[in-house]
């Protein structure tokens, strides 16, 4: 009774998406094969229209307000392969029988997602579906799994039951179900997982929830194939025991209640040891396993936001693959790795925001480490090589600690201070809010990076040569918020500089840039230029794309660079409000609105 | 909640019969709207519904003479039917249908408003 | 299009009768129904929706019920109020269609 529908058609597809729509339409070409009826206000599916379109392979049936699904409304559609009934109101649908979506021969794919859905109108919902891989049930009010939640799915691989009110998965509830295995049960309410037996999962995540332990089957009748664990923000008080999951290769324990042990195990085996901690470290691999080198796998482990004090040196010998390690957010006084050998494989190591005073990395350990993240700790005295003993390290991050660079080679600095001269690999370092006083000559020599920051270290003094040996690599450099009066940098010969932020310190003049250069983006704002004249500015027009000059006691007159720049110029000089000048009369008005006639009177002749 | 009818009174034959409803205490664009018609002694014939998306829905019977439409800014759902005749007399109600379960029904009602098709 | 069939077509009850209404589809409407209430040069009243469900402010003198194709109303106890015309109307797909009507007048 909509005979025309504002539907668009191309081939074999239909997209009725936000129409309106109150019923399925009845006046479609009845050889679609994709119908998208999503975000329309359907309240039933009925056997008639829909059973018209019998070529039907993708139905999409999302956010509609569907509350009513006519027995055998989708048994015409013996071709249909993904039915989405997501966002409806399928909890309302109390008149179902059993098996209330009847039976779906060929559908792989099936997202009952967002229905506000319990558990038993769940089970009367499902009927057969033999060749179903996918189902979402997610962000719906189920509380618990039976062993008849999933029958009659041997095919199902994926299932994704997070946003539920999950407290109680019966024994045998995923028994039926001997092909899955990608399992999402995150955002639920469980609290313990004690006899986890799914050999054949390979991905599970049980994040956001209220699960204080993990444990294992004790008997596996086969080797666990699980891949991917994610247990953060849960109740975890010690690291797992994952002996029995020697393929694991992802694992999330972020978020967590975690303390590492500080003694020595009670126990040779390391597994079922008293309460310290142990019991959960994965020291050892059960008696029957191949492996024998529990994690041996792992490539990327998650501990930020927990508790760890300490890292055992045995914990780290196991790790021979790991590659990303995130410890942020944790306890730590120090970090050790010493040993050669020690993490040989790891890229990634974050330890940002721990209270670490000291780190003591051994000259061949970390070999293959290119980040390391070090923000927001205590770090003060390290041992002058701590970093140049990391042959691959590209990105390293100090942000927040103490550190006080040497100079170069020839110029030995304080004790206490730390060499960043000769780190070959180096390629970005943060020393943001370090205390530095004085930056030695040849700080970075044959270190070529292309970021630097040395931002938020007031008083800091910039030798002369400072930056020596950067000149060819590097492409940002940030000062911000140092109280420098004068720089000591030649920036015209830093060839590559794309971005230069000078922003609040005390600068009123800049180098004259004569030649062409890279600069891209310069930050002056909250500093003390009055003039900006074309003979010192005029090698940036050809680069120069944004320039921030907010809080500068920009003189009205002698500022025609500027003022061609705001009015047709290639640089976008931000300006959130208009840009404020003075004239010397200290008469205050936007530079866009000086005219050069302004600049005239009382003999004031605009110089540029 | 409210639904006030305008626009009724004598059409005369074969022009444009068109009827405005102005309602309040909800919004066009969470409820739908109906109109239905009742000749004198007669029952009820339900004449078109407008979706609170914009999906227009109309009786066979009438489909090729009428057009429903609405001005969520003022409102406002009009009808319009064309070519009327004296079959068309009758006490036109705009009603506004639930919003729960999966039926269409019409929970509040306007006074309706007496048209006239006479020469 | 779904028919709806009412009967009777009039009735004659007194005060405190027990009166019975049905409405029959030509299709399963799986409760898709609704009863109205007219009175002479009011518009309609709904007192019942899916089948058997009271609308708020409705006496529960009256109630809905039956499945499939088969819907009755009854009033329980009639009152001087209650002589009407009442209407039944399907609402499971348009185009919504309605019973003729059923007189309800005093004996």
């Known amino acids: 009774h909509q005979d025309k529908v504002p539907c668009k058609m191309v081939d074999k597809k239909v997209s009725c998406q936000v129409l309106g729509l109150l019923q399925v339409p009845s006046v479609l070409p009845p050889d679609t094969e994709t119908l998208d009826l999503s975000g329309n206000q359907l309240r039933s599916i009925l056997a008639s229209p829909l059973g018209f379109y019998t070529a039907l392979r993708h139905l999409d049936l999302s956010t509609n307000e569907i509350s009513f699904l006519q027995p055998g409304a989708f048994q015409a559609l013996t071709h249909l392969e993904h039915l989405s009934l997501a966002h409806n109101r399928l909890a309302m649908a109390t008149a179902l029988s059993a098996g209330g979506l009847g039976p779906l021969p060929r559908v792989t794919s099936l997202d009952l997602s967002g229905n506000s859905l319990y558990s038993g109108l769940l089970e009367r919902l499902l009927g057969e579906a033999p060749s179903l891989h996918t189902l979402s049930l997610a962000e719906n009010s189920l509380t618990r799994l039976t062993r008849h939640t999933f029958r009659d799915m041997p095919a199902l691989e994926q299932l994704d039951l997070h946003s539920n009110v999950l407290m109680d998965i019966e024994d045998g509830a995923f028994e039926g179900l001997p092909r899955l295995t990608h399992l999402n049960l995150s955002r639920n309410s469980l609290t313990c997982i004690s006899d986890f037996s799914l050999q054949q999962l390979r991905v599970l995540d049980l994040s956001c929830n209220s699960i204080e332990a993990f444990q294992t089957a004790s008997q596996p009748q086969a080797e666990f194939q699980l891949t991917w664990l994610d247990l953060r923000e849960n109740k975890l008080l010690h690291f797992p025991d994952l002996a029995a999951l020697p393929r694991l290769i992802y694992l999330n324990l972020s978020n967590n209640l975690i303390r590492l042990p500080t003694g020595p195990p009670q126990d040779s085996k390391g597994i079922h040891a008293p309460s310290e901690g142990w019991s959960a470290l994965p020291l050892s691999a059960p008696s029957g396993n191949a492996s024998g080198r529990p994690l041996s796998q792992l490539l990327n482990l998650d501990l930020s936001y927990n508790e760890i004090e300490l890292i055992p040196d045995s914990f780290l010998e196991h790790l021979t693959s790991l590659c990303f390690l995130n410890l942020s957010r944790n306890c730590l006084r120090t970090f050790e790795a010493r040993r050669l050998g020690s993490l040989p494989c790891l890229m990634l190591l974050d330890l940002s925001h721990n209270a670490l005073e000291t780190l003591e990395l051994g000259a061949r350990a970390l070999g293959s480490l290119r980040t390391l993240l070090l923000q927001g700790n205590a770090l003060r005295d390290l041992p002058p090589y701590t970093f140049a003993n990391l042959a691959s390290l590209q990105r390293l991050n100090l942000q927040g600690n103490r550190v006080s660079p040497c100079g170069g080679p020839d110029e030995p600095g304080p004790s206490g201070c730390v060499a960043f001269s000769g780190i070959t690999s180096l390629r970005s370092l943060s020393l943001v809010d370090n205390e530095i006083e004085l930056l030695r000559a040849g700080a970075f020599l044959h270190t070529p990076l292309t970021e630097l920051d040395l931002s938020s270290n007031p008083g800091l003094e910039v030798a002369t040569g400072a930056l020596g040996g950067l000149e060819a690599s590097l492409e940002v450099l940030a000062l911000q918020g140092n109280g420098l009066m004068v720089l000591q940098v030649d920036l015209p010969c830093f060839i590559c500089l794309k971005r230069l932020n000078l922003a609040e310190n005390r600068l009123s003049h800049l180098p004259a840039w004569t030649q062409a250069v890279s600069l891209e983006v310069l930050d002056l704002r909250n500093n003390s230029f009055s003039l900006l004249p074309g003979s010192a500015m005029g090698g940036l027009e050809t680069s120069l794309r944004r320039l921030y000059l907010q809080g500068n006691p920009l003189s009205c007159c002698g500022n025609g660079w500027l003022a061609a720049q705001l009015h047709q110029g290639r640089v976008d000089v931000d300006a959130t409000q208009d840009l404020i000048c003075r004239f010397s009369s200290q008469e205050e008005v936007s530079l866009s609105h000086v005219r050069p006639e302004d600049c005239e009177k009382g003999g004031l002749k605009n110089i540029n | 909640v409210q639904l006030v009818e305008s626009g009724g009174g004598l059409v005369k034959p074969s022009q444009t019969l068109s009827l405005t409803c102005t309602v309040s205490?909800?919004?066009?664009?969470?409820?739908?709207v109906s109109w239905v018609r009742q000749p004198p002694g007669k029952g009820l014939e339900w004449i078109a519904t407008i979706s609170s998306g914009g999906g227009t829905y109309y009786n066979p019977s009438l489909k090729s003479r009428v057009t429903i439409s609405r001005d969520t800014s003022k409102n406002q759902v009009s009808l319009k039917l064309s070519s009327v005749t004296a079959a068309d007399t009758a006490v036109y109600y705009c009603?506004?249908?639930?919003?729960?379960?999966?039926?269409?029904?019409?929970?509040?009602w306007g006074q309706g408003t007496l048209v006239t098709v006479s020469s | 299009d779904i028919q709806m069939t009412q009967s009777p077509s009039s009735l004659s009850a007194s005060v405190g009768d027990r009166v019975t209404i049905t409405c029959q589809a030509s299709e399963d409407i799986y409760s898709g129904l609704a009863w109205y209430q007219q009175k002479p040069g009011k518009s309609p009243k709904l007192l019942i929706y899916?089948?058997?469900s009271l609308q708020d402010g409705v006496p529960s003198r009256f109630s809905g019920s039956g499945s499939g194709t088969h819907y009755t109303l009854t009033i329980s106890s009639l009152q001087p109020e209650d002589f009407a015309t009442y209407f039944c109307?399907?609402?499971?797909?348009?185009?919504?269609?309605f019973g003729q009507g059923t007189k309800v007048e005093i004996k």
């Open positions: 899916g089948a058997g």
């Open positions: 009603a506004r249908i639930s919003g729960w379960g999966h039926y269409y029904v019409m929970d509040v």
């Open positions: 205490g909800f919004s066009l664009t969470s409820f739908h």
């Open positions: 109307q399907q609402g499971l797909k348009f185009p919504l269609t």
